[in-house]
């Protein structure tokens, strides 16, 4: 009689996480009598996966009915595979005894687990930044196997090239993580922009996972200010407006100063939204010129999103009162934008709300 051989026909098996793995094993003889055991790994630290003779193995079922006469098929199915199940599995024949003793082992089957990466999580900087600044975004995805993975960055559909990616750990592992950092230069038009991290992996069948970050969470577009004098509404009254343009986010507080003294403070509420996502707002001040003997310096001071205030002033000369409505000769606009921002033409305003 030929000596029993343990045949494991599959050198390797690859299974998707969550599925069942079938590990094949047959023996070539009924002799010697004794049970089959399955182990993961070899040597003293090997892990028992299934013992035909005894034990409770809730995830393991035998593929064939091992009690049936002349059964030589000791293949097993392991349910609900996770990356932690990866390894080399050995089918081992034992010889009946007290105790049973190991007789012969199969050559082993390497089980690799295909595990999907987690949904990429994109996070931006903790604090907002202004246009022309470079900000960093990170993208993380975990739990995938095998190690090979592709990560790309996009801004509004345009692929980015300035990024660094690491896959950990470097050595063999049951599963892996990817971490990438991309640098993005902000522009004034980025309120509606998105940064996208795209992860492609063999488990995703060509349908990559995406994580997004809205630049509206990251960008701060500072306002430009323009103070103008409107035609006289009534005798001795001048209407001065402060146009606050192209700002984001909306959080904004405006203070009118007359000769350095606070006249009124208000918070932007009813604003105009521009097509690029920025906001416009206008405030006006009615100044009773007859109450002033000297020229009046009117200052529109804006605190935007908790940043240091910016202001723009307008000088009203009271020496010559306007004679007729609509004239702009009595008071000269000598204001300057103290922040130095250029004026914007508001062609893209959707609507105007005037706030008293």
């Amino acid at each position: 009689e030929e000596e029993l051989q343990v045949i494991q026909p599959d050198k390797s098996v690859s299974v998707a996480a969550g599925e069942s793995a079938i590990l094949h094993c047959t023996v070539t003889s009924l002799i010697p009598v004794g049970p089959i055991q399955w182990f993961r790994g070899a040597g003293p630290a090997r892990e028992l996966i299934y013992n035909q003779k005894e034990g409770h193995f809730p995830r393991v079922t035998t593929v064939s009915e091992s009690t049936k006469r002349e059964n030589m098929d000791f293949s097993i199915s392991i349910s609900n595979i996770t990356p932690a199940d990866a390894g080399t599995y050995y089918c081992v024949k034992f010889r009946k005894g007290s105790p049973d003793t190991e007789f012969k082992s199969g050559a082993g089957t390497e089980l690799s687990v295909r595990a999907k990466p987690s949904a990429p999580v994109v996070s931006g900087p903790a604090a907002r930044a202004t246009p022309q600044h470079t900000v960093s975004f990170t993208c993380e995805s975990h739990g995938f196997s095998p190690r090979d993975i592709t990560l790309k960055w996009f801004k509004n559909g345009n692929e980015l090239s300035d990024f660094q990616t690491n896959v950990d750990p470097v050595g063999e592992s049951v599963s892996y993580s990817i971490h990438s950092t991309a640098k993005v230069v902000l522009t004034r038009e980025d309120v509606h922009s998105q940064v996208i991290c795209e992860v492609a992996h063999v488990t995703l069948q060509g349908d990559p996972l995406r994580g997004t970050a809205n630049l509206s969470e990251t960008i701060r577009v500072p306002p430009t200010l323009e103070v103008t004098q409107q035609p006289v509404r009534a005798e001795n009254q001048v209407n001065v407006t402060c146009q606050v343009r192209k700002f984001y986010p909306q959080r904004l507080q405006l203070t009118w100063l007359e000769n350095g003294n606070v006249s009124r403070t208000e918070t932007a509420s009813t604003v105009t939204e521009n097509k690029d996502g920025t906001y416009n707002w206008m405030s006006w001040l009615l100044v009773n010129v007859s109450a002033h003997r000297d020229d009046v310096k009117l200052t529109c001071q804006v605190e935007h999103d908790g940043q240091p205030a910016v202001s723009k002033s307008h000088d009203l000369k009271v020496s010559a009162h306007p004679k007729e409505q609509g004239s702009n000769t009595a008071a000269e606009n000598t204001g300057s934008n103290e922040r130095g921002s250029s004026d914007y033409k508001d062609d893209d305003d959707k609507h105007h709300h005037h706030h008293h």
Partner: antibody, heavy 119, light 110 residues
């Protein structure tokens, strides 16, 4: 180690029934056949039947097919053999035995249960 | 059904001598390349103990003075050098079909 512990001796009257139990330990009960064999005083071994606890498949010696019933309780790893319509020549030691190689052989034996049928 | 006939019914052998017990089947017990014959030893007041399986394979813990041979219909259990503890009744069993036992052979010391 494998152990098969059988129930105690029984004395029965002719026409009665007896149910002998065999509690298994030291192995996975559902993975191996259980055989029942009897031996009348001073006589040889006589195979009665066998059962696969995993699915209750049974094979009977034709001589006992109409009078013997094998069952198992997997929750307690116990096998049972019931013999009905007892006669005096059913007096014997009844053994359970485990088949470790699915060869329809008897690798491990219980100590036996003496059943005496007497009026 | 396959009928097994053992011979002799009883046997007396001197200590250290060879003892041979035969078992003949009413038809071949060979199948799938195996001879489906088993040998058991039963000592008084004890259950039987498996000695040989599939005609020629010693069970675990069985001394190597016990051996089995044969094929088809004729099989032999041999004790090469009889020891005092070998006194017992020996049974052959077939499982080519459903199990049946031979009638037994009583082995004594001469």
């Amino acid at each position: 180690q494998v152990q098969l512990v059988q129930s105690g001796a029984e004395v029965k009257k002719p026409g009665a029934s007896v149910k002998v139990s065999c509690k298994a330990s030291g192995y996975t009960f559902t993975n191996y056949w259980i055989n029942w064999v009897r031996q009348a005083p001073g006589q040889g071994l006589e195979w009665i039947a066998m059962i696969d606890p995993s699915d209750s498949e049974t094979h009977y010696n034709q001589i006992f097919k109409d009078r013997a019933t094998l069952t198992t309780d997997t929750s307690t790893s116990t096998a049972y053999m019931e013999l009905r319509s007892l006669r005096s020549d059913d007096t014997a030691v009844y053994y359970c035995a485990m088949d470790y190689g699915s060869l329809y052989a008897m690798d491990y034996w219980g100590r036996g249960t003496l059943v005496t049928v007497s009026s | 059904d396959i009928v097994l006939t053992q011979s002799p019914d009883s046997l007396a052998v001197s200590l250290g001598e060879r003892a041979t017990i035969n078992c003949r089947a009413s038809k071949s017990v060979s199948s799938s390349g195996y001879n489906w014959i088993f040998w058991y030893q039963q000592k008084p007041g004890q259950p039987p103990k498996l000695l040989i399986y599939l005609a020629s394979n010693r069970d675990s813990g069985v001394p190597d003075r016990f051996s089995g041979s044969g094929s088809g219909t004729d099989f032999t259990l041999t004790i090469s050098s009889l020891q005092a503890e070998d006194v017992a009744v020996y049974y052959c069993q077939e499982s080519r079909e459903l199990p049946t036992f031979g009638q037994g052979t009583k082995l004594e010391i001469k």
